[in-house]
Each structure stands twice: as structure tokens, then as C-alpha cells.
């Protein structure tokens, strides 16, 4: 387990020609807020398949308004980092996307209005634990500074956060053919990679990922005490003195929720509930009414009635919590029948049916797909007489075993060309045409049927704001 | 493993027509991109000579190659091929076909194949 | 026709030297910034290191690094080591669907 960190340094126009138009003007001030996506591996998949290593959301910028004939200088950031948990091995290589959002502030009906910027993607190696790595990433006319790295939570170390330190149980060397843990050298190698979390006092594994609790403790990470009253004789290195057991810590402890937020354990880590008002991953973040735009997962804000209720978000279907910030377990509710395997895939849910059944629950019993297997998540439906597959988002094909093009709806207009690339579908525009889609007519004199680009949008683009 | 691997003859005789065979492994043409072709001459520099782009197999040829140069796809195969024809000794070159998936590079190459044009 | 000039199209330098090229096109390359570098060394293909005229291709040492846009385009290696001897294109993408490589650059160890 681990954090990965993005530090952006600033965020404004690129050298060279045709510098973009300021984002905010006095009629319409704005302040821009940024969205990293990370995913694993060197991805060729589209900027709409998901953030599988996590994403994150900064907090919102200054208010920045545009002095009347300056050209656009660096904006004004917020203030943090980005940060994005992962619970696993930090995967080495990873493909990343960052957006930059303009929030304007103006008289709109019905709150801020938000809208795309400029979005980066790169593919990058970066060893966990190392130093910040710098970089600079251009979109049209707009330049982007930032800064990155990933860091293991304790007990976690090494480039991939898999091996785990314990501290030491004799005073001079660590156990056989144990190392010490640089640079933590007072402390060891663990010898297994447990599951992540499970109690260094309390929890023992013999396999990796796995979590086995010495006698006296329960739980999943080992961190929950039999019985506190009782006084057992606990085996193995956390032996009390006493005899006696006491609770051992747990992730909870403390209580790591502020603005009072209660805590729960997960299996991997906790779990703020906040109170109104407050979001973030330790209720962290204040004073929060809609203009934040604090409701996640196309959530609808609509303002309290009362300062102790400065918004109330309704979520949508799938979505639950204060901030619309949890995803709804709907499979716990076992819709598939028939052995079926359930899948959330946020926007629905899908059965994956054993051989032999089809429909979108699994009801219907098909001889003709017995024995027939749709891959990648695809379901095998009754066909008169012959087995077809509907296939998960993302696959096409008979047996749903080809990616699905993003370029399938021939996106770019006017004889563009769309091409697959891994940040996302990218559209080179034919000669005349111009705009994220080859939208616009370029006209004679140069100028654009643009109504009002994308700053650093230019003739003959190519798609950057999707 | 995604692989570009051109085959094709090592020796052609001056007027024939060279057809030389691009085979692609670990992705589908069900995705949009261009496959192209780019050649070098013994100690020379890289020439693009054309490409097919496979979201409608539309091609587009260097502006020497128009003419002489013809890309083509057999999807059932998992290859795209060239022609070339009317071959002189001008066109001896190691022969690559390569992959371009979006902002204007080849970030996909085959090893490259060396056709000698000689009577 | 467009024309990508590549300078110099040969440059001798020693180990640790800061080495910049430089790529001129007749057109602008499409969206401004549709450039990219290649690395070639001798029986092999070109290896991709920059493209979009600043992005670093993965497991690319940080030592290259590229930039300009339109019409003039610089690759920079930083710290120039032994195994970065090898010829060095520019490709360009323009409106029209069309590409072109510049000329090359030989860049040889003192």
C-alpha cells in the first residue's frame, strides 16, 4: 500500500507563437481545479476506460480574474497535493492522465459552470520511494509543470511498497536470512508480504497476502481482541509480560477522522464518515457549500438550509455517502440467479453467467450456450439456436475477445481521422477543418466558425479536449 | 507481445514489381490506426513512403511513391502489404513497416527487411 | 514537397557535453506540436524517444528532452553518455495526413 503524490507547480501558457486567451475575464472570473487518473502498466487503453490504480481531485484554486489587454500569465493553483492511495504493489509503469478544469464563476443559472481545460497523458516508469520526478507536459498552448512520486505507507517499503518492515526483535541483528530494511535499519525485512494491513503484533502469514491471527485475536487484519476482560497467554513475539492481552493498535485508533467524522476499519485500511460540511479522505476539507462542487460521481448538489447543512448531495443510482464519495455494494443483494457472477461496473450491473444460463440476470437456461464461453466479462445469450455474446463495455467481437474501438462511432466529423491512442481518442482533422471533434470550418481568412474555442485551440488541432 | 514483423524476397530484379508483407500479433485492426511503411537506403536516411489507415483503409502515399506505391490490408490474415512497382537499384533499402497510434509518431517497428534490386 | 533540415548532420562530442539538434519543417507541423525524435543505431530499427515534441517515451533516460513548435523543433541530451552514440531523426506530421523525417544526425563519441 502507498500514495501516490502530484505536485503541480504551475499551470499557463507554453512558449513559442499564439499564446492562449486568459481562461477567466472580469465578466466571467474562474479558478481551475485539476483531475489526475492512474493506471497501471504501459496502457493502450482509452481515456474512458477507468482510473484502475485510483484518481484524485484537487481542491479549488483562487479566484483569478483577468486584467483587461495582460496577456494570460501562470494561474493561480490550489493549494496541496494530489494525492491517490493504492492498496496494492505499486505497479512500477503507469500511464497517467491530468486534467486541468476551469470553474467559472459568473451569474449561471443552476451553479458553476464546469469545463475542460486541457488534458495531459504520459506513460511513465517510477520506483516507489524514490525522489520527486519533474515534468512538463504541453496541450495545445497551454504548458503544465508538476511534479510526482509514490511513496509506501508503513509497514510497506521497497520500489514496489511488497516488502514489509517489522521492527526488530533482538537488539543486534535481524532473524535468519532476514535483511535489515534500508534505510530504516533499526528495523527488518518482513519474511512474507501479508495482506496489507494485518497487525505486525498479532497476525502471522504462511502464505503471501494472506492474514492468520495468533491465538486471542480476530478479525481480518488480526487487530480485533477475543475477549479484553479475559486474561489469556497469548503465543508468539507480542507475549505481554503480564500474560494479560490488551487491544492492539488498530488503523482506527486515535481516530483519524477530523470535524467529526467517525471512523470504521476495512479490510485494507478505515473509512471516514463525515459530517456535513466535510469531505475528504480524513473529513479534512471544510466550509464546503455547492460553488465547491463537493458531490462526487455526477452527484446533485442542492444548498442546505442552514449553515450546519450547507449542501445536501443527491446521489445517484450506485453512489451513497455524504459526498456521493461510495460506490454501493449492489451485488450484496446477489441479483444473478443460477450461480451467475456479479459485476459493478458503476454505470450497471452485469451478470456473468455460468455456461448453460443467459439473460441479464442469469434467468434464462440455454442449451445452445452451454460449453461456449464469452470472454472478457461477456454474457452468452440465446440466439435462435445459436449462441451470441453481449459483451462487457470495451470488448466487441463474436466472442467478445477483441477492444472495442473508440473510434467505432467515427467520432471526427468532416473526413477526420480518429486514431486509438492510449491517453484517449485522438482526432486528426482533414484539411479546413478544425476543433476537438473537426467540428469547425477554418475559413479563407484564417479565422474560425468557432463560437468561442478552447483557449490554444488552432486550426488543424488535434482532439485534446475531450 | 505486440510485434510488426515484415517478410518478404531479399533479392528482386530491376522492372518487377517488390511485395513485401507486414504481419502484426497482440493487437486487432477492429482498432484505428495507421500502418505504414518507411524505408532506408544503405547509409542513408529514413523515407516515408506511405500509409493505410485502418479505420477505412483510406491510403496515403509520399509524394514520389504516388503511382509506383500500393498499401493494402488482408484483415482475415493479420497483415497489410506493399507494392512497389517498376523497381530500380535506387530502391535497394532495408524495408519497415511501422505503427501509428495518434499524435504523429511510429511507436511501433518492425526489425526491418533488406531487399537488394540487382539483375 | 516538405522538407524537415536537420543541423548538424554530424557532431562529434565528448562524454558529459550538453548536444542539441535542431529540426526546421517548411510547414508547421499539424496541431503545432505533431513532432517526434527517433534514436537509430546501426541493424536496427529507430527506437521512439520524444514525441509530440516534448513527451519522453517511456523508459527514455531523463537526460533527452525535447521542445519547440510549428516550425522549429530542438532535441537536448543533457549529459551525453557513451551508449547515446547513434543517429538521430526528427518526423514530422502534418495536415493532409502526410509524414516526413529529417535527414538525420550522426552523433559520435570524442
Known amino acids: 500500500a502507498g500514495v501516490f503524490e502530484l505536485q503541480i507547480h504551475s499551470f499557463g501558457p507554453g512558449p513559442g507563437p499564439g499564446a492562449p486567451r486568459s481562461p477567466c475575464s472580469a465578466r466571467l472570473p474562474c479558478r481551475l481545479f485539476f483531475r489526475v487518473c492512474l493506471k497501471p502498466g504501459l496502457s493502450e487503453e482509452a481515456a474512458e476506460s477507468p482510473c484502475a490504480l485510483g484518481a484524485a481531485l484537487s481542491a479549488r484554486g483562487p479566484v483569478y480574474t483577468e486584467q483587461p489587454g495582460a496577456p494570460a500569465p501562470d494561474l493561480p493553483l490550489p493549494d496541496g497535493l494530489l494525492q491517490v492511495p493504492f492498496r496494492d504493489a505499486w505497479p512500477g509503469t503507469f500511464s497517467f492522465i491530468i486534467e486541468t478544469w476551469r470553474e467559472e464563476l459568473g451569474d449561471q443559472i443552476g451553479g458553476p459552470a464546469w469545463s475542460l481545460l486541457a488534458r495531459v497523458a504520459g506513460r511513465r516508469r517510477l520506483a516507489a520511494g524514490g525522489p520527486w520526478a519533474r515534468d512538463i507536459q504541453r496541450a495545445g498552448a497551454w504548458e503544465l509543470r508538476f511534479s510526482y512520486r509514490a511513496r509506501c505507507e508503513p509497514p510497506a517499503v521497497g520500489t514496489a511498497c511488497t516488502r514489509l518492515c517489522r521492527p526488530r526483535s533482538a537488539p543486534s541483528r535481524c532473524g535468519p536470512g532476514l535483511r535489515p530494511c534500508a534505510p530504516l535499519e533499526d528495523e527488518c525485512e518482513a519474511p512474507l508480504v501479508c495482506r496489507a494491513g494485518c497487525s505486525p503484533e498479532h497476525g502471522f502469514c504462511e502464505q503471501p497476502g494472506e492474514c492468520r491471527c495468533l491465538e486471542g485475536w480476530t478479525g481480518p487484519l488480526c487487530t480485533v481482541p477475543v475477549s479484553t476482560s479475559s486474561c489469556l497467554s497469548p503465543r508468539g513475539p507480542s507475549s505481554a509480560t503480564t500474560g494479560c492481552l490488551v487491544p492492539g493498535p488498530g488503523p482506527c485508533d486515535g481516530n483519524p477522522c477530523a470535524n467529526g467524522g467517525s471512523c470504521s476499519e476495512t479490510p485494507r485500511s478505515f473509512e471516514c464518515t463525515c459530517p456535513r460540511g466535510f469531505y475528504g479522505l480524513r473529513c479534512e476539507v471544510s466550509g464546503v457549500t455547492c460553488a465547491d462542487g463537493p458531490c462526487f460521481n455526477g452527484g446533485l448538489c442542492v444548498g442546505g438550509a442552514d449553515p450546519d447543512s450547507a449542501y445536501i448531495c443527491h446521489c445517484p443510482p450506485g453512489f451513497q455517502g455524504s459526498n456521493c464519495e461510495k460506490r454501493v455494494d449492489r451485488c450484496s443483494l446477489q441479483p444473478c440467479r443460477n450461480g451467475g457472477l456479479c459485476l459493478d461496473l458503476g454505470h450497471a450491473l452485469r451478470c456473468r453467467c455460468r455456461a448453460g444460463f443467459a439473460g441479464p440476470r442469469c434467468e434464462h437456461d440455454l442449451d445452445d450456450c452451454a460449453g461456449r464461453a464469452c470472454a472478457n466479462g461477456g454474457t452468452c445469450v440465446e440466439g435462435g439456436g445459436a449462441h451470441r455474446c453481449s459483451c462487457a463495455l470495451g470488448f466487441g467481437g463474436r466472442d467478445c475477445r477483441e477492444r472495442a474501438d473508440p473510434c467505432a462511432a467515427r467520432p471526427c466529423a468532416h473526413g477526420g481521422r480518429c486514431y486509438a491512442h492510449f491517453s484517449g481518442l485522438v482526432c486528426a482533422c482533414a484539411p479546413g477543418y478544425m476543433g476537438a471533434r473537426c467540428e469547425f470550418p477554418v475559413h479563407p481568412d484564417g479565422a474560425s466558425a468557432l463560437p468561442a474555442a478552447p483557449p490554444g485551440l488552432r486550426p488543424g488541432d488535434p482532439q485534446r479536449y475531450l | 507481445q505486440v510485434t510488426l514483423r515484415e517478410s518478404g524476397p531479399a533479392l528482386v530484379k530491376p522492372t518487377q514489381t517488390l511485395t513485401l508483407t507486414c504481419t502484426f500479433s497482440?493487437?486487432?485492426?477492429?482498432?484505428?490506426?495507421?500502418m505504414g511503411w518507411v524505408r532506408q537506403a544503405p547509409g542513408q536516411g529514413l523515407e516515408w513512403m506511405g500509409t493505410?489507415?485502418?479505420?477505412?483503409?483510406?491510403?496515403d502515399y509520399a509524394s514520389w511513391a504516388k503511382g509506383r506505391v500500393t498499401i493494402s490490408v488482408d484483415k482475415s490474415k493479420n497483415q497489410f502489404s506493399l507494392k512497389l512497382s517498376s523497381v530500380t537499384a535506387a530502391d535497394t533499402a532495408v524495408y519497415y513497416c511501422?505503427?501509428?497510434?495518434?499524435?504523429?509518431?511510429?511507436?511501433?517497428w518492425g526489425q526491418g527487411t533488406l531487399v537488394t534490386v540487382s539483375s | 514537397d516538405i522538407q524537415l533540415t536537420q543541423s548538424p548532420s554530424f557532431l562529434s562530442a565528448s562524454v558529459g557535453d550538453r548536444v542539441t539538434i535542431t529540426c526546421q519543417s517548411t510547414?508547421?507541423?499539424?496541431?503545432?506540436?505533431?513532432l517526434s525524435w527517433y534514436q537509430q543505431k546501426p541493424g536496427q530499427p529507430p527506437k521512439l524517444l520524444i514525441y509530440?515534441?516534448?513527451n519522453l517515451e517511456i523508459g527514455v533516460p531523463s537526460r533527452f528532452s525535447g521542445s519547440g513548435s510549428g516550425t522549429d523543433f530542438t532535441l537536448t541530451i543533457n549529459s551525453l553518455e557513451a551508449e547515446d552514440a547513434a543517429t538521430y531523426y526528427c518526423?514530422?506530421?502534418?495536415?493532409?495526413?502526410?509524414?516526413?523525417f529529417g535527414g538525420g544526425t550522426k552523433v559520435e563519441i570524442k
Open positions: 511501422a505503427r501509428h497510434t495518434g499524435y504523429g509518431y511510429f511507436g511501433l
Open positions: 497482440g493487437f486487432s485492426l477492429s482498432s484505428s490506426y495507421d
Open positions: 493505410i489507415y485502418t479505420g477505412d483503409y483510406s491510403t
Open positions: 510547414e508547421s507541423v499539424y496541431g503545432s506540436d505533431w
Open positions: 509530440q515534441a516534448s
Open positions: 518526423q514530422g506530421y502534418y495536415s493532409g495526413y502526410i509524414y516526413a
